[in-house]
């Protein structure tokens, strides 16, 4: 163990103050008691330490709590923070929101960093599932944190919270993302009627089966082109005209700007050309009239 | 007890000279950075200068830089301000306080006058 | 004009909350913590509160301080005619290399 210099007379901290920010990191580490550090954390936020001294604090905190600081510490690191490496996370207890909440301000702006990563996972892991207060708070700080996560740990997503979910939070998930999501909202908005359901479920509809298109379709919800192209292929397919044109209702005419493109061209294969000529849109590659039109999906699953 | 005590103040001419010291008890002074505020007539507070417990570097406003100078004597657990080149908009009590990023102990403070 | 942006007066009865806002920038308040000072009239400023919160020993709890963005909040609460004094909020700004305090607010006890 090497020797510890001690504190010169006259300079033991007796509180956490602004004096200490004069003090050599020597000084910092011989002079300031850890307890009092950890009663006092509060204060470390709101005086411009350089990183270099907060280096020096959080060695003393380590020293202090080898396996984990206590969320009473915790909740008020503020920029130290900052210093934190995801192993050293790993070693905490979080269960406060107020504390989760602290600590994502600290980071506010910026990327999410692997600190971060850590936090909500230690956080979300201890609370069990990703509760809506959960949810509202990590949505505003990261609005692309739903979809950063795994099908598997979307699923311990509750209905209830996907009240939460703002359109936003969506634009950078994936299909399969979509496929958990969606059925936990469909159930969530299942109360409300037509209009204020297709609001709610639009953002979801990625995930959502031909079947529930097909519903849609019946309801004059007037889809955007947007929606549309965010369909699952599979689940586009089987829709005919008369339903595309009943789901699409005067945002229709927009198909024609999409014709190359999945799932408006991987649809227009599938759909005879004499129905996609009654649209009026002048789309073209559909199967020609007279000629018949195998299922083989279907005689697949029947052999 | 922590004390702060001002003295030098008082009646000069435009263009003239005063130093003001700031005598400091019941606190390690060595430690601690000190600030001067000032406070004209009927007017609110302004920060004029701080310099932190070493010296080694010192904060104006830019309202007295170049004409003020704060300096400190560690030993003599004393603060000062040389004021030169005087304007009557310096007239003002003025305040010496410990700290530079909130102030919880200041003086009495001192009247400065600065008329012909 | 002073760097930080206080309301020149505020006022209530005995017993009534009475709240005083302070605007900055991100160089000062965005960035620093901030105080507050209550001078009487004929006395020299007193620490009210500290590191945005915090309240010096002696200080009542009817004083209460809040931080948020840019901008700080002073709260009284169950106010007194002991509380009618000049309040100033000051924090460092890292782009003046200086202290900047606001204009002060005069709080009067109806």
């Known amino acids: 163990e090497v020797e510890k210099t001690a504190c010169p007379s006259g300079k033991k901290a007796r509180e956490i103050d602004e004096s200490l920010i004069f003090y050599k990191k020597w000084e910092l580490e011989a002079c300031v008691d850890a307890a009092l550090l950890a009663t006092q954390m509060d204060r470390v936020n709101a005086i411009p330490f350089t990183y270099e001294q907060l280096d020096v604090l959080k060695h003393k905190l380590d020293e202090l709590y080898p396996q984990g600081y206590p969320e009473s510490v915790i909740q008020h690191l503020g920029y130290l923070f900052l210093k934190m490496s995801p192993e050293d996370i790993r070693k905490w207890n979080v269960t406060s929101l107020e504390t989760l909440k602290a600590l994502l301000e600290v980071n506010k702006g910026h990327e999410m960093s692997p600190q971060v990563a850590t936090l909500i996972d230690r956080f979300v892991k201890g609370r069990g599932q990703l509760d809506k207060d959960t949810l509202d708070t990590l949505t505003a700080f990261y609005p692309g944190y739903l979809c950063s996560l795994s099908p598997e740990e979307l699923s311990s997503v509750p209905p209830s919270s996907i009240w939460a979910v703002r359109p936003q939070d969506l634009d950078t998930c994936d299909p399969r993302q979509l496929d958990v999501l969606y059925p936990k909202a469909r159930l969530a908005f299942q109360n409300m009627n037509g209009s204020e359901y297709f609001v709610k479920i639009q953002s979801f509809l990625g995930g959502a089966p031909t079947e529930d298109l097909k519903a849609l379709s019946q309801q004059n919800v007037s889809m955007d082109l947007a929606t549309f192209m965010k369909l699952r292929t599979d689940a586009v397919l089987p829709l005919t005209v008369a339903e595309v044109q009943k789901l699409l209702g005067p945002h229709v005419e927009g198909l024609k700007a999409e014709e190359r493109h999945r799932p408006v061209r991987d649809w227009i294969l599938r759909q005879r050309q004499d129905d996609l000529d009654t649209l009026g849109l002048g789309l073209q590659g559909g199967i020609p009239n007279g000629y018949l039109v195998l299922d083989l999906s279907m005689q697949e699953a029947l052999s | 007890e922590v004390q702060l005590l001002e003295s030098g103040g008082g009646l000069v001419q435009p263009g003239g000279s005063l130093r003001l010291s700031c005598a400091a008890s019941?606190?390690?002074?060595?430690?601690?950075?000190m600030s001067w505020v000032r406070q004209a007539p009927g007017k609110g507070l302004e920060w004029v200068s701080g310099?932190?417990?070493?010296?080694?570097?010192?904060y104006y406003a830019d309202s007295v830089r170049g004409r003020f100078t704060v300096s400190r004597d560690n030993s003599k657990n004393t603060l000062y301000l040389q004021m030169n080149s005087l304007r009557a908009e310096d007239t003002a009590v003025y305040y010496c306080?410990?700290?530079?990023?909130?102030?919880?102990?200041w003086g009495q403070g001192t009247l400065v006058t600065v008329s012909s | 004009q002073s760097v930080l942006t206080q309301p020149p007066s505020a006022s209530g009865t005995p017993g009534q909350r009475v709240t005083i806002s302070c605007t900055g920038s991100?160089?000062?308040?965005?960035?620093?913590?901030v105080s507050w000072y209550q001078q009487l009239p004929g006395t020299a400023p007193k620490l009210l509160i500290y590191?945005?919160?915090k309240r010096p020993s002696g200080v009542p709890d009817r004083f209460s301080g809040s931080k948020s963005g840019t901008s700080a909040s002073l709260a009284i609460s169950g106010l007194r005619s002991e509380d009618e004094a000049d309040y100033y909020c000051?924090?460092?700004?890292?782009?003046?290399?200086?202290?900047?305090f606001g204009g002060g607010t005069k709080v009067t006890v109806l």
């Open positions: 306080a410990k700290n530079m990023l909130s102030f919880d102990y």
């Open positions: 019941g606190f390690t002074f060595s430690n601690y950075a």
């Open positions: 310099i932190p417990p070493n010296s080694d570097s010192k």
């Open positions: 991100s160089s000062n308040i965005g960035s620093n913590a």
């Open positions: 590191y945005n919160s």
């Open positions: 000051g924090s460092w700004d890292p782009s003046l290399n200086g202290y900047v």
